[in-house]
Interface confidence: medium
């Protein structure tokens, strides 16, 4: 009996036309939602004038349906038993699952001012930037609608830059009508233990963002893992959102709609400083902001964001060192709400439920040449928003799963 089940599973999890896995892989049957909470700055003037702590108040959720589009350009390569594809991006606002509309206003850091002053530290260029910032009536903070902040707006300061640069700015600009990839993953035909594991991303086996092994593209994209998952395994996966590979470890057994699943979580060790976890040494790319690589819980992904000083963390700086959040008031980290987990059905390796949580922050530094940043006395890693991307297997799919997979085994 067990051998037959193993044989069936091995056949059905292969990523090729006609298998259960392939159908669900091309276009997920699970509804995936991305909820955003925006950090509304309550005291912009005091920060700018007195270098006070930034007081934030989170507002949300603002919910979008995401990942509803089928994978594109799916191409099987029988030579190396891989399948390549693009994952198109799309987001549809869900008013009924949101606290307000896309026209809601927020006071947030001026993204262009913070980024430009960081990218161009040259004193002469900063003098030029200062005149453009002043001329455009830009400041350290700005008021933007949710739609503008997430999906893009024309920045008045960038519109004055003396050579033709893109003047559109947004936390996720551009998003709609773009695609992530090309991903090339193993289809499992030759070895089921490699199914869904990424061979190359954008044509390469490494990212060119990090030194040494930190730069490797490891594991799957977390939507599924090779079958017959063990609790002792460390599940590696790559997330283009955070520009790195990361891993999850077993936490507990969970019953999901009658299906026994393993809950794997991202451990605090994955966010530790190299002092606490030497494996993370190559994720520390600069010495000043990281206080000589002793800070933890934030990841500088500027190399992956065209030099913009973007830092990724867990929401509310969960698992981050105290120095990171000491300049911010109003944060309440909470493991239950703010950690990331994956609920994996161990026989198939399919992720049947997940919650991916992350926070996007921007570094802003004092600059004696830029008037609106002149009075700052310290660096700030400013939280802009955090997101919770979730998906749960539907009732019908769960029923089918119970009868075809777990039912047969039990």
């Amino acid at each position: 009996g067990d051998m037959l089940i193993q044989k069936t599973i091995k056949k059905e999890v292969v990523l090729e036309e006609g298998t259960i896995a392939f159908k669900n892989w091309v276009k997920t049957g699970t509804e995936i939602y991305r909820q955003f909470w925006i950090f509304d700055v309550q005291n912009p003037q005091e920060v700018m004038m007195n270098s006070s702590n930034i007081q934030v108040k989170q507002r949300g959720p603002y919910t979008y349906r995401v990942r509803f589009l089928a994978k594109e350009n799916i191409t099987q390569d029988p030579k190396d038993n891989t399948v390549s594809f693009l994952q198109p991006n799309g987001a549809i606002f869900e008013p009924s699952l949101s606290v307000g509309t896309e026209a809601d206003n927020f006071t947030v850091l001026n993204l262009a001012v913070a980024a430009a002053s960081h990218i161009y530290p040259n004193p002469f260029v900063q003098v030029v930037l200062n005149s453009l910032i002043n001329k455009s009536k830009s400041s350290m903070f700005q008021v933007r609608t949710l739609r503008e902040l997430l999906w893009g707006y024309t920045d008045p300061f960038l519109s004055l830059v003396p050579y033709p640069v893109s003047t559109r700015v947004g936390m996720f600009y551009p998003y709609n009508n773009t695609a992530d990839g090309v991903y090339k993953v193993f289809n499992g035909k030759d070895s089921i233990s490699k199914v869904a594991i990424i061979d190359t991303y954008k044509g390469k086996r490494n990212l060119s963002y990090w030194e040494s092994y930190c730069d490797m593209i490891n594991g799957t994209d977390a939507a599924s893992f090779p079958p017959f998952v063990e609790k002792s395994q460390v599940l590696q996966f790559f997330s283009s959102d955070i520009c790195r590979s990361i891993y999850a470890v077993f936490e507990s057994d969970v019953n999901l709609k009658g299906i026994p699943v393993y809950r794997f979580v991202l451990p605090s060790k994955a966010f530790a400083s190299p002092v606490q976890n030497p494996d993370n040494h190559c994720f520390c790319t600069e010495k000043i902001i990281s206080k000589n690589c002793t800070s933890y819980g934030v990841l500088d992904i500027s190399k992956c964001k065209e030099g913009k000083p973007v830092y990724i963390s867990l929401p509310h700086f969960l698992y981050a060192s105290p120095d990171v959040s000491e300049t911010i008031d109003g944060l309440n980290p909470n493991e239950e709400e703010h950690r990331t987990y994956l609920d994996i059905e161990p026989i198939t390796g399919f992720t049947l439920q997940f919650a991916k949580r992350l926070q996007v922050n921007l570094l802003v530094k004092p600059s004696n040449k830029i008037q609106v940043l002149k009075r700052l006395k310290r660096n700030y890693i400013v939280p802009i928003l955090w997101l919770n991307e979730t998906g749960t297997i539907g009732d019908e799919k769960a029923k089918m799963f119970r009868s075809q997979v777990t039912g047969k085994i039990n």
Partner: antibody, heavy 115, light 108 residues
Framework: EEKLEESGGGLVQPGGSMKLSCVAS????????MNWVRQSPEKGLEWVAE??????????HYAESVKGRFTISRDDSKSSVYLQMNNLRAEDTGIYYC??????WGQGTTLTVSS | ENVLTQSPAIMSASPGEKVTMTCRAS???????LHWYQQKSGASPKLWIY???NLASGVPARFSGSGSGTSYSLTISSVEAEDAATYYC?????????FGSGTKLEIK
């Protein structure tokens, strides 16, 4: 202080090749679009080529008169920009400057194409 | 190609005089992308005015720039001996990038 230093100029015969180099210091080279501009008494200042950033996939633009003959490239790890010039003509003679245009210019390197 | 025509080609002025030189573009361009460079004999060009009217770092306040569309100008309110140089306008609004042929300012 930002500094740009061009090298590689000299005398070359028509139809020949030459590679110019430019090393930058004093600014974050990898954040700037880089250009080559040349100057001759006959034509004055003439833009030659531009190369953008890694994030722009190192996009390049060329003046019509050098398209297909000249290639601009950069190595951010060495803070350097290069100009590979093939099939040189007498009208390519001049002082070649490398510059992020809105910053400082180098002192230039002289190329003479003559038989 | 957006051709920039500078006039006059050569001008002469006495210290204290006000001088204006012009730069005309063959097609309209955004004032954000029109710049002026100063080049003294034997030296490389230096950015002098950017985006039509903004003085580069260290440029004396007697210099000013103005214009829009196809017509731009550089003015020195009270010329000094150190202003003797050739001034070039340049556009960055489209490829190819182009320079004017220059206006040489001589001081009497």
């Amino acid at each position: 202080e930002e500094k740009l230093e061009e090298s590689g100029g000299g005398l070359v015969q028509p139809g020949g090749s030459m590679k110019l180099s430019c090393v930058a210091s004093g600014f974050t080279f990898s954040n700037y679009w880089m250009n080559w501009v040349r100057q001759s008494p006959e034509k004055g200042l003439e833009w030659v080529a531009e190369i953008r950033l890694k994030s722009n996939n190192y996009a390049t633009h060329y003046a019509e008169s050098v398209k297909g003959r000249f290639t601009i490239s950069r190595d951010d790890s060495k803070s350097s920009v290069y100009l590979q010039m093939n099939n040189l003509r007498a009208e390519d003679t001049g002082i070649y400057y490398c510059t992020p245009l809105l910053l400082r210019w180098g002192q230039g390197t002289t190329l003479t194409v003559s038989s | 190609e957006n051709v920039l025509t500078q006039s006059p080609a050569i001008m002469s002025a006495s210290p204290g005089e006000k001088v204006t030189m012009t730069c005309r573009a063959s097609s309209s361009l955004s004032s954000t992308y029109l710049h002026w460079y100063q080049q003294k004999s034997g030296a490389s060009p230096k950015l002098w005015i950017y985006s039509t009217s903004n003085l580069a770092s260290g440029v004396p306040a007697r210099f000013s720039g103005s214009g829009s569309g196809t017509s731009y100008s550089l003015t020195i309110s009270s010329v000094e001996a150190e202003d003797a140089a050739t001034y070039y306008c340049q556009q960055y609004s489209g490829y190819p990038l182009t320079f004017g042929s220059g206006t040489k300012l001589e001081i009497k």
